[in-house]
Interface confidence: medium
């Protein structure tokens, strides 16, 4: 057997140079660095690349899939509802996420080189758009819910209270994602590829526990609660009532649903179990480490695919933006005007009542 | 179930070698930082060395230092402890042990083999 | 000489509480884990870091830590809990136990 018998000098320096395990999005709770990685991880080099090629996958879908969304609704003045205000901040959210995209490629295979500026500024915009992006799915539910089961329009219709909702949204997602801003920064290790994680130095396990929380139950928890419920009422006034799009509403509703949970729901259960075992409720040993640093990884490219599915469900799905999308294209000559169908509208998400949309 | 099985004790005079087996089985053995530690006859526990779970990194008490070689073969998930030029007071019962290390400030021992005793005398 | 210094022995009537100390520079910053040991027998993790139990151990263990100082702590002492106790922590040097404490159940 070959031995690597390199004899450390110190027994601190025993533990140095283990790789790092990957820093998780939405994760603000680092691995443990301060005394050096204790675990030998479980990792295999193709398993990286594989990793950077559905970033660059999910970066250009994102890209292309958001700004053609935005591009619809912005040309769309005229009809705009109060959804597709929301799904403008959406589109805008994952479009900004997405831009981080390369730049956390980059540092899975060669580390963090970029800086603690870069670490705090892309680490910031991504918290801010994962935080804004959920809430403002939250938000849509709500909107479809006091459209369908409350026919409510006035509240919606205050074109000043909605971009006050917006606004908030970002506003509360800059707060939640402040800690990052504070606290991150590149850390550099012996023999180990410099990281970007929250260094807190020697504050308290309390600090650590708020800020892994937050982007549980901000991020996933709370809008997931609001969805279940504001969609679950709505598809029940569907049943009830004979609306004449019922199926199709229904269809994109079960869409929406079905794919957040899909993306998020293994994610955030995998982050519970790991919050759980690093607070020591369950204990933790290196096996149960490897597992659950292996499981973050796949779980987490689910979350980071959910930034570019939402153009698809919910434009793509309704017709009303595939009928936005050829009358731009008309407009700029590329398509003609005689393909345009007969009913297009310039709102793309669905028959509106108001200002305020029930389908999508 | 983690099984730690040491083997290689024996009688052996002083100046002489004797290299102990550990068999490890019911864990991913290349995932954890490995160790022996010994208990002379009638006295307490005393740390021997340490491996890293890839084996690129060993650490040796200081009383051990020069004399001893840990070693590690994942493929048989097998640890070992070469000792060299051994004395009297090497008499103990050797034990192989699973280093748990999960956070930078606790390393503890959760699993123990049933020992293999060495003795050293003339 | 052990870098963790704990009391040779401690005697507690059944049913009582025993405490065994263990102190020593490195748990200022470092977890302490503890061990039981029956004669004839291999070591057992009884606690480990200050405070935690592994499963399997029961509830009358507990652990806990002052400043340089870690305590065991036995409540409901039992006849079948008579063992040699060690706690154990690092530094930079390795891995350090202490000299151990004889739990007598009187």
């Known amino acids: 057997m070959e031995d690597f018998n390199m004899e450390s000098d110190s027994f601190e320096d025993f533990w140095k140079g283990e790789d790092l395990s990957n820093y998780s999005y939405s994760s603000t709770l680092p691995p443990f660095l301060l005394d050096a990685a204790p675990c030998e991880p479980e990792s295999l080099e193709i398993n990286k690349y594989f990793v950077v090629i559905i970033y660059a996958l999910v970066f250009l879908l994102s890209l292309l899939g958001n700004s053609l969304v935005m591009l619809v609704i912005l040309y769309s003045r005229v009809g705009r509802s109060v959804t597709d205000v929301y799904l403008l901040n959406l589109a805008l959210a994952d479009l900004l996420f997405a831009l981080t995209l390369p730049i956390w490629a980059a540092s899975k295979v060669n580390g963090w080189i970029f800086g603690t500026f870069l670490c705090k500024v892309v680490s910031l915009l991504k918290e801010v758009n994962f935080y804004s992006g959920i809430l403002l799915l939250a938000c849509i539910s709500v909107d479809r819910y006091l459209a369908i089961v409350h026919a409510t329009r006035t509240l919606t219709q205050k074109r000043y209270l909605v971009k006050f909702i917006c606004l908030s949204i970002w506003g509360l997602s800059l707060l939640l994602a402040l800690p990052v801003l504070l606290f991150r920064r590149t850390v550099y290790s012996s023999n180990v590829s410099p990281a970007c994680y929250e260094d807190m130095g020697n504050n308290t396990a309390n600090w650590r526990m708020l800020l892994r929380i937050l982007p549980q139950s901000f991020g996933f928890i709370v809008p997931l609660l609001i969805m279940l419920f504001c969609y679950g009422f709505t598809l029940r006034t569907l049943f009830k009532a004979h609306m004449g799009q019922k199926h199709r509403a229904m269809r994109v509703i079960f869409a929406v649903v079905l794919i957040f949970l899909l993306c998020w729901l293994p994610y955030n259960l995998v982050l519970l179990a790991d919050t759980l075992m690093r607070t020591q409720v369950i204990q933790e040993t290196c096996e149960r480490r490897n597992h659950i640093d292996r499981a973050l990884d796949a779980t987490e490219i689910l979350g980071i695919l959910h930034s570019c599915l939402n153009p698809l469900i919910y434009a793509f799905i309704g017709q009303k933006f595939r009928h936005g999308l050829l009358k731009i294209l008309a407009i700029h000559g590329l398509i003609s005007k005689d393909s345009l169908p007969k009913d297009s509208r310039p709102s793309f998400v669905g028959s509106s009542s108001g200002h305020t949309s029930t389908t999508l | 179930e983690v099984q730690l099985l040491e083997s290689g004790g024996g009688l052996v005079q002083p100046g002489g070698s004797l290299r102990l087996s550990c068999a490890a089985s019911?864990?991913?053995?290349?995932?954890?930082?490995m160790s022996w530690v010994r208990q002379a006859p009638g006295r307490g526990l005393e740390w021997v060395s340490a491996?890293?779970?890839?084996?690129?990194?060993?650490y040796y008490a200081d009383s051990m230092k020069g004399r001893f070689t840990i070693s590690r073969d994942n493929s048989k998930d097998t640890l070992y402890l070469l000792m060299n030029s051994l004395r009297a007071e090497d008499t103990a019962v050797y034990y192989c042990s699973k280093l748990e290390a999960v956070s930078g400030t606790g390393k503890y021992f959760q699993h123990w083999g049933q020992g293999t005793l060495v003795t050293v005398s003339s | 000489s052990y870098e963790l210094t704990q009391p040779p022995s401690v005697s507690v009537s059944p049913g009582q509480t025993a405490n065994i100390t263990c102190s020593g520079d490195?748990?200022?910053?470092?977890?302490a884990c503890w061990y039981q040991q029956k004669p004839g027998q291999s070591p057992v993790l009884v606690i480990y870091q200050d405070t935690k139990r592994p499963s399997g151990i029961p509830e009358r263990f507990s652990g806990s830590k002052s400043g340089i100082t870690a305590t065991l702590t036995i409540s409901g002492t039992q006849a079948m809990d008579e063992a040699d106790f060690y706690c154990q922590a690092w530094n930079s040097r390795g891995v350090v136990f202490g000299g151990g404490t004889r739990l007598t159940v009187l």
């Open positions: 019911g864990f991913t053995f290349s995932s954890y930082a």
């Open positions: 490195t748990l200022g910053d470092k977890f």
């Open positions: 491996i890293r779970g890839s084996g690129a990194g060993t």
